[in-house]
């Protein structure tokens, strides 16, 4: 038998330092967590003391704080070099600022294999990308060698800006071929490594035959064995065991999130490559393990360059702002109410006596919130903490749609709601009540909009015929997060200002601000 | 002592048939894929055919394809190449290897066919 | 003619470093390991390095490996007498589906 220790990420998001324990900036020292200073702690420990280790990264390094603002991914590769990773797969982040934005600092900086068995190229850019990132990559362990695939999800263009020189196939059908010539060269030890969220992480696993183990990320999803050591509730057992069609177990993993934990999976595989057991879980990347030295100097000799954004303070805070996935994907969270107003704000025209404003909803989906701002530090509101809850870049737009329109998009919100997607929409100028015991597609039993042609703004029942102005994310008027039908069916769209300028211009002309939750959105059951 | 061993080989006329065996010793067997590589007389290595440990698949080179078959039998820890409709540019030492990781990490003595008239 | 292109010979004398280069393209050296065997004259040939750049338990370390795009290499340094063989590269061609060997390349110690 031989024994195989894998170690994983994923979804990190740009969270080099280390955080609070939601993942936001680190306040207290004492009990923060994660960043790659310790990563590197713990990952040297295993190296040292284990034979047969593999540290691998399932995508989204990119995205999420003002490191990826300021360095636009070459933190990443720096820093993913110094711990020498074995292998990454790219994640759907990975695209944000382009392929360019991808091949420049990342691709051709870092010195191990970055992977996507479905991402084919094409046009100009088959030739440029070529060799940049790999289907598949083999390994040498000691003795023995292991097979990498990656995969991303083919939700990619919707979720980012690969371009239209890159084809984002199905899954199994590009990993199945990869897997069976990596089999025809008898590599018989497989690694599915890969960024399609947990879901498809099992029907990898089920359905590639040949893959003996999955890595995955994008759905951020914790799994555990025992009982969990921070908030996070484990969706499962690690390693989540899924039975494959041809009858073997297969392991499947993740990591959570944000570098908050280090996946520790052991393998064991016979002489033929078939896993014997497999058992592990993640580690908790605590206080109580130490930063390392040399990487947390290089950190802080790369942090110099952000200072200027950080030290800014913009306003002051009074209350937890809640940005978290847990609320902003589920229910009203206060960070999303924040941020519509101060989206609407930025849009006050007062240019015709009969509207008290041209416009007075707004639209954003929880998923585009990526972290929360706590509040116990001062009450300071930095351009940092800005860039961690709205990392994308994206510019906040008006559109005009009619009222069929986005009685679709509030339906299409909740269509699959409790699984932690990005497409529950926070709102502002808005009153919306869900009935969840209802079908999808026909779980909106109330939908009112407050009046812009009002001396006093009240909220009326949505008129399906009716054209509305609303401001939202680019991202959605571009059709993000499945809302195909804002893109289909938008009257007009004009582009407006960067996000994260919006809200801090907003939180600088308020001082101090404490958004509530106030019943924007309700859930109810029966008849109405 | 980790080894393989060909046989089979000798002369035979054009069009004829000759079955080389490749015996396997001092490892698992069922454990790996497996290749014949040849060798002209003077002339550089040329891969003839090979089989996957797993799943049994078989692959050919297009100089061969219709006239060879690779197959094994794990019990008797054997390779064979059954070559069919031989032809003189067939001639050549035909090489039993073990394909190990993502290569060819053990080589046979090799047996020499010689296709004459 | 063999799909991986090598020099048919090349020489050194003792002590000397040479490189023998492998050229290939995208759908085998390109996306594929090389791989690189020596074979002593009169006897089957035994692999060397594995994985591009990775050597075989008991190989000495005089002999190296790399890869980029669509070429290898093999480099010795060092060279003694009994490095005097024929050298090939070979790797899996995706196109074809089958292994590919470089022609060979006749290694002469002066």
């Known amino acids: 038998a031989w024994e195989l220790t894998i170690l994983h990420t994923n979804d990190v998001h740009s969270r080099l330092e280390q955080t609070s324990e939601d993942s936001s900036k680190c306040v207290n020292a004492s009990r923060c967590m994660g960043g790659v200073a310790r990563l590197f702690t713990k990952v040297q420990q295993i190296r040292r003391a284990e034979p047969n280790v593999l540290l691998l990264d399932a995508g989204d390094q990119y995205q999420g704080t003002i490191w990826f603002t300021v360095y636009k991914g070459a933190e990443v590769a720096h820093f993913m070099n110094a711990l020498r990773y074995d292998a990454m797969a790219l994640g759907n982040h990975e695209f944000d600022n382009g392929v360019e934005g991808l091949i420049e600092p990342l691709l051709k900086e870092a010195k191990f294999p970055i992977l996507s068995a479905n991402i084919k190229a094409k046009g100009p850019l088959a030739s440029q990308i070529s060799g940049l990132y790999l289907p598949y990559k083999v390994l040498p362990v000691g003795d023995e060698v292991v097979g990498i695939v990656g995969y991303t999800s083919k939700e990619t263009p919707f979720l980012s800006n690969p371009g239209t020189n890159l084809v984002f196939e199905d899954e199994i059908t590009a990993l199945q071929p990869e897997v069976d010539k990596l089999k025809t060269l008898n590599v018989n030890k497989i690694i599915a490594l890969g960024h399609s969220g947990f879901e498809m992480d099992k029907l990898i696993a089920q359905k590639v035959r040949g893959v003996d183990v999955v890595v995955g990320g994008h759905s951020n999803t914790f799994l555990y064995t025992g009982n969990p050591p921070s908030k996070e509730v484990p969706a499962g057992k690690y390693p989540f065991i899924v039975t494959s069609d041809d009858g073997r177990k297969v392991p499947v993993v993740q990591a959570y999130a944000f570098g908050k934990y280090l996946g520790y999976l052991k393998i064991e595989f016979d002489e033929r490559g078939n896993v014997i057991s497999s058992h592990g879980n993640p580690i908790l990347l605590n206080s109580s393990i130490p930063e390392d030295p040399s990487i947390k100097a290089d950190i802080n000799k790369w942090r110099i360059k952000l200072d200027n954004y950080s030290t800014q303070e913009l306003g002051k805070t009074i209350v937890y702002l809640d940005g978290s996935s847990q609320s902003c994907r589920f229910r009203e969270c206060n960070m999303g109410n924040l941020i519509c107003d101060a989206m609407i704000n930025n849009n006050l025209r007062h240019t015709d006596e009969m509207f008290w404003n041209h416009v007075s909803m707004c639209i954003l989906n929880g998923g585009g919130i990526r972290s929360p701002i706590d509040e116990r530090n001062n009450g300071t509101i930095t351009w940092e903490n800005l860039a961690a809850v709205l990392p994308f870049g994206g510019t906040f737009d008006l559109v005009q749609l009619k009222g069929s329109t986005l009685k679709k998009a509030f339906e299409h919100s909740v269509h699959r709601y409790g699984q932690s997607t990005g497409e529950f929409l926070q709102v502002g100028g808005i009153h919306v009540v869900y009935d969840l015991s209802r079908k999808p597609g026909d779980r909106v039993v109330k939908l009112d909009v407050l009046c812009t042609k009002c001396r006093v703004p009240s909220y009326d029942p949505l008129k399906m015929d009716e054209v509305y102005k609303v401001i939202l994310p680019n991202f959605l008027a571009n059709g993000g997060d499945g809302f195909q039908m804002i893109k289909d069916e938008l009257l007009r769209h004009d582009s407006g200002d960067q996000d994260i300028n919006v809200v801090s211009t907003y939180i600088s002309k308020m001082k101090v601000i404490y958004p509530a939750v106030e019943g924007r959105i309700k859930f109810s059951t029966g008849s109405h | 002592e980790v080894q393989l061993l060909e046989s089979g080989g000798g002369l035979v006329q054009p069009g004829g048939s000759l079955r080389l065996s490749c015996a396997a010793s001092?490892?698992?067997?069922?454990?790996?894929?497996y290749s014949w590589v040849r060798q002209a007389p003077g002339k550089g290595l040329e891969w003839v055919s090979a089989?996957?440990?797993?799943?049994?698949?078989?692959y050919y080179a297009d100089s061969v394809k219709g006239r060879f078959t690779i197959s094994r039998d794990n019990s008797k820890n054997t390779l064979y190449l059954q070559m069919n409709s031989l032809r003189a540019e067939d001639t050549a030492v035909y090489y039993c290897?073990?394909?190990?990781?993502?290569?060819?990490?053990?080589w046979g003595r090799g047996t020499l066919v010689t296709v004459s008239s | 003619q063999s799909v991986l292109t090598q020099p048919p010979s090349a020489s050194g004398t003792p002590g000397q470093r040479v490189t023998i280069s492998c050229s290939g393209s995208?759908?085998?050296?390109?996306?594929?390991?090389v791989n690189w065997y020596q074979q002593l004259p009169g006897t089957a040939p035994k692999l060397l390095i594995y994985?591009?750049?990775q050597r075989l338990g008991g190989v000495p370390d005089r002999f190296s490996g790399s890869k980029s795009g669509t070429s290898a290499s093999l480099a010795i340094s060092g060279l003694q007498s009994e490095d005097e063989a024929d050298y090939y590269c070979?790797?899996?061609?995706?196109?074809?589906?089958?292994?590919?060997f470089g022609g060979g390349t006749k290694l002469t110690v002066l």
């Open positions: 290897a073990r394909l190990g990781y993502s290569t060819i990490d053990l």
């Open positions: 001092g490892f698992t067997f069922s454990s790996y894929a």
């Open positions: 089989i996957s440990g797993s799943w049994g698949r078989t």
């Open positions: 995208l759908s085998n050296i390109g996306r594929n390991d």
């Open positions: 994985l591009n750049n």
């Open positions: 070979a790797t899996w061609d995706d196109s074809l589906k089958g292994w590919l």
